[in-house]
Interface confidence: low
């Protein structure tokens, strides 16, 4: 499975989606954890609601959100005030019993932001969403401030 | 025993909406996923869309896309369709169907609404 | 889309014959198949999910098999209140969940 790198600004959100085949994991939680190191385990950092058909409602554990929208096959991760102790490696699982399938692995690089730099002559200018096979991510423009989606039809 | 009663027959206009609707009972409304499938006179059967009566989140066909909502009042228990800017062509019998949970099969279906269009 | 294509599109059988319904879709569906007997007038009713298994209820002489994009629906030894049309379903690939044409079951 490919590790997918996200980069975002300290300080700001980052959102990841994780999508996943909707009828391969019916029924099933899905979860966002941290690996600790290359081979190490997965910590688990949040999942989704206990009660599978109340997934789609957002779940939070401090600075992280989860929801998972079943339908659509796609689990949303919202890490917000970004610190670079949130840099590192992740993965999206969907769980089943004690079992972990993973969905997408995400390597989430924290990026200062130039606009606290005090000699940026520069403003920052955020590039265009990235999108990438399994996963996605939209950067929020302003500090503090979740773009949110536009909710899935 | 798990029952989806759907409302009566409807005439409609061409250009008009009409609202279809379907009471569960038997069964946890909010437990299944509910579809909708409709069947054109000697035709076969068209999956619709899918509503999940909790969130209620829903997925179209994209034949449908912008002309139909489904929406659910989980306090009856109670799905409905609703197909706008209507043409003859959607004269059928509309299904509402309940999902279980262990396939994505439709195990139970309504009796069926006739929706006739005509000028 | 994906087409699922069903033959024959009728048949005549006799009370006690074997019957075979085949089904195919134009991609993979793993085995994500169902398959609906509807009467006239009345809601299509399911036999059989997930290509192979059978609904509750439904008697044993209703069977089916295939995966991939291949699939079969027998009835061992047609019955008198089996005379129907029958359809497969594909719900793999969401939004575009499909129906095959439907087989009619006539009395021979």
């Known amino acids: 499975l490919n590790t997918t790198v996200l980069q975002g600004m300290a300080g700001q959100s980052l959102r990841v989606s994780c999508t996943y085949d909707a009828l391969k994991h019916w029924g099933r939680r899905k979860a966002w954890c941290r690996q600790l190191g290359e081979e190490g385990p997965c910590q688990r950092v949040v999942s989704t609601h206990g009660v599978w058909l109340l997934a789609f409602l957002k779940k939070r554990n401090g600075s992280t959100v989860i929801a998972d929208d079943t339908l659509a096959g796609t689990v949303t991760i919202t890490l917000k005030n970004l610190q670079a102790g949130d840099a590192g490696l992740y993965q999206c699982q969907s769980l089943r019993g004690r079992e972990a399938e993973v969905l997408q692995k995400v390597l989430v690089e924290v990026l200062e932001d130039p606009l606290d730099d005090q000699d940026a002559g520069d403003l920052w200018v955020p590039e265009e969403s990235s999108s990438f096979e399994g996963a996605q991510v939209e950067h929020s423009t302003s500090r503090n401030q979740e773009t949110s989606f536009p909710p899935t039809s | 025993q798990v029952q989806l009663v759907q409302s009566g027959a409807e005439v409609k206009k061409p250009g008009a909406s009409v609202k279809v609707s379907c009471k569960a009972s038997?069964?946890?409304?909010?437990?299944?996923?509910m579809s909708w499938v409709r069947q054109a006179p000697g035709q076969g059967l068209e999956w619709m869309g899918v509503?999940?009566?909790?969130?209620?989140?829903?997925v179209y066909a994209q034949k449908f896309q912008g002309r139909v909502t489904m929406t659910r009042d989980t306090s009856i228990s109670t799905a409905y369709m609703e197909l706008s800017r209507l043409r003859s062509e959607d004269t059928a019998v509309y299904y509402c169907a309940r999902i279980p949970s262990y396939t994505y099969a439709f195990d139970y279906w309504g009796q069926g609404t006739l929706v006739t269009v005509s000028s | 889309d994906i087409q699922m294509t069903q033959s024959p599109s009728s048949l005549s059988a006799s009370v006690g014959d074997r019957v075979t319904i085949t089904c195919r879709a134009s991609q993979d569906i793993s085995n994500y198949l169902a398959w609906y007997q509807q009467k006239p007038g009345k809601a299509p009713k399911l036999l059989i999910y997930r290509a192979s298994s059978l609904q509750s209820g439904v008697p044993s002489r209703f069977s089916g098999s295939g995966s991939g994009t291949d699939f079969t629906l027998t009835i061992s030894s047609l019955q008198p209140e089996d005379f129907a049309t029958y359809y497969c379903f594909q719900y793999r690939h969401m939004p575009s969940q499909t129906f095959g044409q439907g087989t009619k079951v006539e009395i021979k």
């Open positions: 038997g069964y946890t409304f909010t437990g299944y996923h």
């Open positions: 509503i999940n009566p909790v969130s209620g989140n829903t």
